[in-house]
């Protein structure tokens, strides 16, 4: 808290300008009018105030707007945004994408701070859904943003927004998140032709069910091993050796290097050894010839 002192004669700031960098904290408090500061916030960012001086300016704005800053001020906060707490930001009503961009720019190159997370949350809730422009903006600043959302939050993403998603935006998503995103991607890209469709859908396939993988195997897609390894184990297990061979195309040889890792390991255990041998890769661990394969899940369903 800055002590209230009278402004010395001749020090009253007629405008927000660079000379204020020399004002001591108590002089800023006493000599800068809060309403003037609010109307000239766009100048503050161009002036190299110290962090302690910024604290004083924030204090003045807090007194002027105890219920939260108006968007006209928020848009021009610049470095002063770094001084805001999540509690401050929860009082804001941010509706303009330009305001969001301006504030994200201030934090650019840093990890997503609690302030930024709160700002984004306020903005998205205000809009009601994660529209394409917002998603475009957020993933440009924070490639991992999408994967930081819960499956429930992701359910509000409209399929049209999926066009803004780049492969690297999904790098840290877990299967539960991809389960939500995959159907949206499938819907978004449904009118594309085979090879183009596969390029777009590839990053989302960690949420694909067995029947979609079977369908892809009929389209000569040549899925790479990295993508295959991210598929849901339960979706891969029912695939036949022939279907996996078609799905991977020339990349099928990579199975040997991954035979100890999921989902390849679990898939091998479900295949007849005879069928695995047809690949000529030396994959071991399949069901020996002459053994009867019981589908226990079907048996449980009947009992």
């Amino acid at each position: 808290e800055v002590e209230k002192t009278a402004c010395p004669s001749g020090k009253k700031a007629p405008e927000i300008d660079e000379s204020l960098i020399f004002y001591k904290k108590w002089e800023l408090e006493a000599c800068v009018d809060a309403a003037l500061l609010a109307t000239q916030m766009d100048r503050v960012n161009a002036i190299p105030f110290t962090y302690e001086q910024l604290d004083v300016l924030k204090h003045k704005l807090d007194e002027l707007y105890p219920q939260g800053y108006p968007e006209s001020v928020i848009q021009h906060l610049g470095y002063l945004f770094l001084k805001m707490s999540p509690e401050d930001i929860r009082k804001w009503n941010v509706t303009s994408l330009e305001t969001l961009k301006a504030l994200l720019e201030v934090n650019k190159g840093h990890e997503m701070s609690p302030q930024v997370a709160t700002l984004i949350d306020r903005f998205v809730k205000g809009r009601g859904q994660l529209d394409k422009d917002t998603l475009d903006t957020l993933t440009a600043f924070y490639p991992g943003y999408l994967c930081s959302l819960s499956p429930e939050e992701l359910s509000s993403v409209p399929p049209s927004s999926i066009w803004a998603v780049r492969p690297q935006d999904l790098d840290t998503c877990d299967p539960r998140q991809l389960d939500v995103l995959y159907p949206k991607a499938r819907l978004a890209f449904q009118n594309m032709n085979g090879s183009e469709y596969f390029v777009k859908i590839q990053s989302f396939l960690g949420g694909a069910p067995t029947e979609d993988l079977k369908a892809l195997s009929q389209q000569n897609v040549s899925m790479d091993l990295a993508t295959f390894m991210k598929l849901r184990t339960d979706a891969v297990l029912p695939l036949t050796v022939a279907e996996v061979q078609k799905l991977l195309g020339p990349h099928v040889e990579g199975l040997k290097a991954e035979e100890r890792h999921r989902p390849v390991r679990d898939w091998i255990l479900r295949q007849r050894q005879d069928d695995l041998d047809t690949l000529g890769l030396g994959l071991q661990g399949g069901i020996p010839n002459g053994y009867l394969v019981l589908d226990l899940s079907m048996q449980e369903a009947l009992s």
Epitope: I21, T50, Y51, E52
Partner: nanobody, 127 residues
Amino acid sequence: EVQVVESGGGLVQAGASLRLSCASSGRTISPIAMAWFRQAPGKERELVAGLTWTGRTYYSDSVKGRFTISRDNAKNTVYLQMDSLKFEDTAVYFCAAGDNPDRRGSSWSSSSVYEYWGQGTQVTVSS
């Protein structure tokens, strides 16, 4: 690296004038701020006058109306014109330059904000 050298100090009578010069070298662009500080015996270093990269000026209350800070860009020199000198203006005067990219420190009136300093020039005002 910026080098800062002051000159122009001396012994004068109260009411007289002096002009201090501060030549800076080692860079082509203006620092964010150039300032004159002074330090009297047994006292803390205090800001006398400041000049921003855009030419805005600031004066401490004790010298306002008597001192003028200015600069000559062509010569990379900042001046402090001191008129109506008083006995209490006696001190070592230091020129400082600051870029402060990390915005630490309390304000630009604080000596801790400035990276580059001259050795100081003595100003003595006799009554």
